[in-house]
């Protein structure tokens, strides 16, 4: 998943739609012209801008990778929202790809959290209740369970 986002200051929208910049900035869904005098609309489904800005171009829409489902399409003011397919998840520290969820917990551990598009199954030790993190265990050491379904 490739994404370019901007985070300028938030601004209150003006009372009316303007085709010229307000205080040097153009509204979400637009970018500024090369002479700085006009606001040009982003192209629906191709690019977008999320904030008031003085960018000379809109940001390219993300295309969902294989292994991802599109939750919402790209509009002129919002980027595409992609989510990992059922049975896979994306970790914060490796956002570039969806990884398969583990099918079960190691022996001596119990599952307390399902597979979601943003987290693997969660396992804790039966006695201590402490979390387990690490690679998926060997198949013969697992207690199988069905993966969770993506949240809508």
């Amino acid at each position: 998943i490739t994404q370019q986002d901007l985070a300028p200051q938030q601004r209150a929208a003006p009372q009316q739609k303007r085709s010229s910049p307000s205080e040097g900035l153009c509204p979400p869904g637009h970018h500024i012209s090369e002479d700085g005098r006009d606001c040009i609309s982003c192209k629906y489904g191709q690019d977008y801008s999320t904030h008031w800005n003085d960018l000379l171009f809109c940001l390219r829409c993300t295309r969902c990778d294989s292994g991802e489902v599109e939750l919402s399409p790209c509009t002129t003011t919002r980027n595409t929202v992609c989510q990992c397919e059922e049975g896979t998840f994306r970790e914060e520290d490796s956002p570039e790809m969806c990884r398969k969820c583990r099918t079960g917990c190691p022996r001596g551990m119990v599952k307390v959290g399902d597979c979601t598009p943003w987290s693997d199954i969660e396992c804790v030790h039966k006695e201590s209740g402490t979390k387990h993190s690490g690679e998926a265990p060997a198949v013969e050491e697992t207690v199988t369970s069905s993966p969770g379904t993506p949240a809508s």
Partner: antibody
Framework: QVQLVESGGGLVQPGGSLRLSCSAS????????MIWVRQAPGKGLEYVGF???????YYASWAKGRFTISRDNSKNTLYLQMNSLRAEDTAVYYC???????????WGQGTLVTVSS | DIQMTQSPSSLSASVGDRVTITCRAS??????LSWYQQKPGKAPKRLIY???TLASGVPSRFSGSGSGTDFTLTISSLQPEDAATYYC????????????FGGGTKVEIK
Amino acid sequence: QVQLVESGGGLVQPGGSLRLSCSASGFSISRYAMIWVRQAPGKGLEYVGFITSDSSAYYASWAKGRFTISRDNSKNTLYLQMNSLRAEDTAVYYCARYTYSDGTDLWGQGTLVTVSS
Amino acid sequence: DIQMTQSPSSLSASVGDRVTITCRASQSISTYLSWYQQKPGKAPKRLIYKASTLASGVPSRFSGSGSGTDFTLTISSLQPEDAATYYCQPNSGIATYGAAFGGGTKVEIK
């Protein structure tokens, strides 16, 4: 002749204030965004802030609250008001004409500001 | 803010050499990048804008290329008067992101 001339630099004590002026000739500043850039001795160029043609000012994060950019279109002059000056503000300050797509196309000669006790 | 990473920070080359300076933006700026030349005690001078457009009066031995995040300034045949420090600067989103210059590349003649 199209040019920019800065003035107002000099020696100022820490905590003091200074107002730099940038006088334009050969073109009207009202039609352009204008930018201030500074350069500490032996260092690189550092963006200070800029002002749009409709007089909205934007600043580098470190300059917010201490520095104020304004313009007087009738005098064809750009200003940089600097308050609560620190030793690290010692630099040559340049004003320049900024065009959105074509960059900073016209620069002044710079004025030296020295902050020292 | 956009960060501009310039390399190398300095270089020494002989007259007639081909010199290449690179500038990398922390996020895409399309082709909206300018290059400046600064000689000691002087104001910067714009060399190139829109990544590859030569400014008026600039010798044709200077050229620029790149788009997105990676940009290059090339001096095809270094001349003694090219001894200077060179800076890159993004031109898109100055109010949105600021306009941080690259750290500069000092070019010396061997």
